[in-house]
């Protein structure tokens, strides 16, 4: 018996071939011997089966001795043995229809779980293997679960259902709703304007929700809400903003915040959350601000950084075009009695300068100049 696998909602064509290459009488029946369709001369006739409005054949092939049964918009319950009677012969074809669906919406928040459920006919014992867009393979039976979805899981999932050494492939498009970056860090000299950007990693027609930026300054004992906003059809409107600092927010996507001045008291970490309409859970992006200050007080030239720096970063003070006078894994370094000239304070990671501040040291009888 020939086995054919079909996909729910698709069209399948079951073949039936006579030895005579001409139009002769044929009938297609199901396992209950109920006629589905056949011919009367050159006319297509249909029986009382439940497939009535979804069954068809190709009259153009009858003259070649081919009498296919076409079933449109397949349902799981269409799984059956179909019998083609032609020339006193009976050809049996077993049709097995499978369906694969995502448990919920195919737009899921980062960190949520994706469950794929296989619908299969009674008596079948299929195996399923799915390949994610990033090439990760998962296997299972009737259900497959992927916990903690990541941004790289966005895209087309290809799932193969295997039954009786035959396979059928399903493609499911999954959109993981997330920010492009889970975390970002901004390095600024004291007094510079700070730009925070929160680009989304997905595009949808309408985007509605609300968001908030909570900030934990390094110098503060507790975090505070810096700004709250609404999002309506990709338009941003500020609901509430603190007086210090007075953040500005762009009116269009991507979400964009401006801090007029980088100051040591603002250095720290923030968490921007975005709650989307009709979605449980929130999108998160962490943002960090590191602020540098170079100062000269009497005979002491000091360079300091505030904010979440890593213990691998090196802070250095050097006279322009000379070797570093001091280079340490600290958040503050200083030089006593610095020579006159342009001094550079450098925060670097494996030789790559992340932040630089210059300060001009004048001969001892004059005051320092900050360029």
């Amino acid at each position: 018996k020939k086995v054919v696998l079909g996909k729910k909602g698709d069209t399948v064509e079951l073949t039936c071939t006579a030895s005579q290459k001409k139009s002769i009488q044929f009938h297609w029946k199901n396992s209950n011997q109920i006629k589905i369709l056949g011919n009367q001369g050159s006319f297509l006739t249909k029986g009382p089966s439940k497939l009535n409005d979804r069954a068809d054949s190709r009259r153009s092939l009858w003259d070649q001795g081919n009498f296919p049964l076409i079933i449109k918009n397949l349902k799981i319950e269409d799984s059956d043995t179909y019998i083609c009677e032609v020339e006193d012969q009976k050809e049996e074809v077993q049709l097995l229809v499978f369906g694969l669906t995502a448990n919920s919406d195919t737009h899921l928040l980062q960190g949520q779980s994706l469950t794929l459920t296989l619908e299969s006919p009674p008596g079948s014992s299929p195996s399923v293997q799915c390949r994610s867009p990033r090439g990760k393979n998962i296997q299972g039976g009737k259900t497959l679960s992927v916990s903690q979805l990541e941004l790289q899981d966005s895209g087309t999932w290809t799932c193969t259902v295997l039954q009786n050494q035959k396979k059928v492939e399903f493609k499911i498009d999954i959109v993981v709703l997330a920010f492009q970056k889970a975390s970002s860090i901004v390095y600024k000299k004291e007094g510079e304007q700070v730009e925070f950007s929160f680009p989304l990693a997905f595009t949808v027609e309408k985007l509605t929700g609300s968001g908030e930026l909570w900030w934990q300054a390094e110098r503060a004992s507790s975090s505070k809400s810096w700004i709250t906003f609404d999002l309506k059809n990709k338009e941003v409107s500020v609901k509430r903003v603190t007086q210090d600092p007075k953040l500005q927010m762009g009116k269009k996507l991507p979400l964009h915040l401006t801090l007029p001045q980088a100051l040591p008291q603002y250095a720290g970490s923030g968490n921007l959350t975005l709650a989307l309409e009709a979605k449980t859970g929130k999108l998160h992006q962490e943002v960090n601000l590191v602020v540098m200050r170079a100062t000269q007080l009497q005979k002491n030239l000091t360079c300091e950084v505030w904010g979440p720096t890593s213990p691998k970063l090196m802070l250095s003070l050097k006279l322009e075009n000379k070797e570093a006078k001091v280079s340490k894994r600290e958040k503050a370094v200083w030089v006593l009695n610095p020579e006159a000239g342009m001094w550079q304070c450098l925060l670097s990671d494996s030789g790559q300068v992340l932040l630089e501040s210059n300060i001009k040291v004048l001969p001892t009888w004059s005051t320092p100049v900050q360029p």
Partner: antibody, heavy 121, light 113 residues
Framework: QVQLVQSGAEVKKPGSSVKVSCKAS????????ISWVRQAPGQGLEWMGW????????KYAQKFQGRVTITADESTSTAYMELSSLRSEDTAVYYC??????????????WGRGTLVTVSS | DIVMTQSPDSLAVSLGERATINCKSS????????????LAWYQQKPGQPPKLLIY???TRESGVPDRFSGSGSGTDFTLTISSLQAEDVAVYYC?????????FGGGTKVEIK
């Protein structure tokens, strides 16, 4: 498993130059920096400098400034250390080493087997 | 530059006994900003490159036997081999990575008595 494979032993005349190579096999070369450390016979370890293949940035110990040049070829995952104006006291085993997690000015979790450079007239 | 001084220069210890190596830095290698000691210990056997044993002054590198331990803070550090084995015969070096240039101690040779 990443390995650092160094070039063979060299015998050089005083005043000449030597170029030692260090090839990274089995890993992404650009994701970590390479430092050079030397060891004179029966002596301790001496850091010479490093290269960051990502940026091409280099840093040299003051003692070797002007005499040492560290380069890298990303296409072959190879770092090079060239020491010029050789003198007898440069006779040493020259090691390339990787800073843990790609960090430079760090501790070294992976070393090459060393290249003996002998400077003799 | 930070100068690293090791003592003793050499040490002879009976098998199964404790071996203690000291390392002193000319300036602190403890970062008050990050609350870490930027000090590593290496083992070097004849004809071989150094092998990392300890970093952050007391964190054992994976695969290193637990008879090796590091302690100390600021300027004074110790490497202890709790029960010396034959395969521990080597030269041991300390290294600071708090400040550039990176500097190593002169080494301590450990032998069996």
């Amino acid at each position: 498993q990443v390995q650092l494979v160094q070039s063979g032993a060299e015998v050089k005349k005083p005043g000449s130059s030597v170029k030692v190579s260090c090839k990274a096999s089995g890993g992404t070369f650009s994701s970590y920096g390479i430092s050079w450390v030397r060891q004179a016979p029966g002596q301790g370890l001496e850091w010479m400098g490093w290269i960051n293949p990502n940026s091409g940035g280099t840093k040299y110990a003051q003692k070797f400034q002007g005499r040492v040049t560290i380069t890298a070829d990303e296409s072959t995952s190879t770092a090079y250390m060239e020491l010029s104006s050789l003198r007898s006291e440069d006779t040493a085993v020259y090691y390339c080493a990787r800073g843990e997690a790609g960090n430079l000015d760090w501790y070294f979790d992976l070393w090459g087997r060393g290249t003996l450079v002998t400077v003799s007239s | 530059d930070i100068v690293m001084t090791q003592s003793p220069d050499s040490l002879a210890v009976s098998l199964g006994e404790r071996a203690t190596i000291n390392c002193k830095s000319s300036q602190t290698v403890f970062s008050t900003s990050y609350n870490k000691n930027y000090l590593a210990w290496y083992q070097q056997k004849p004809g071989q490159p150094p092998k990392l044993l300890i970093y952050w002054a007391s964190t054992r590198e994976s695969g290193v036997p637990d008879r090796f331990s590091g302690s100390g803070s600021g300027t004074d550090f110790t490497l202890t081999i709790s029960s010396l084995q034959a395969e521990d015969v080597a030269v041991y070096y300390c290294q600071q990575y708090y400040s550039t240039p990176l500097t190593f101690g002169g080494g301590t040779k450990v032998e069996i008595k």
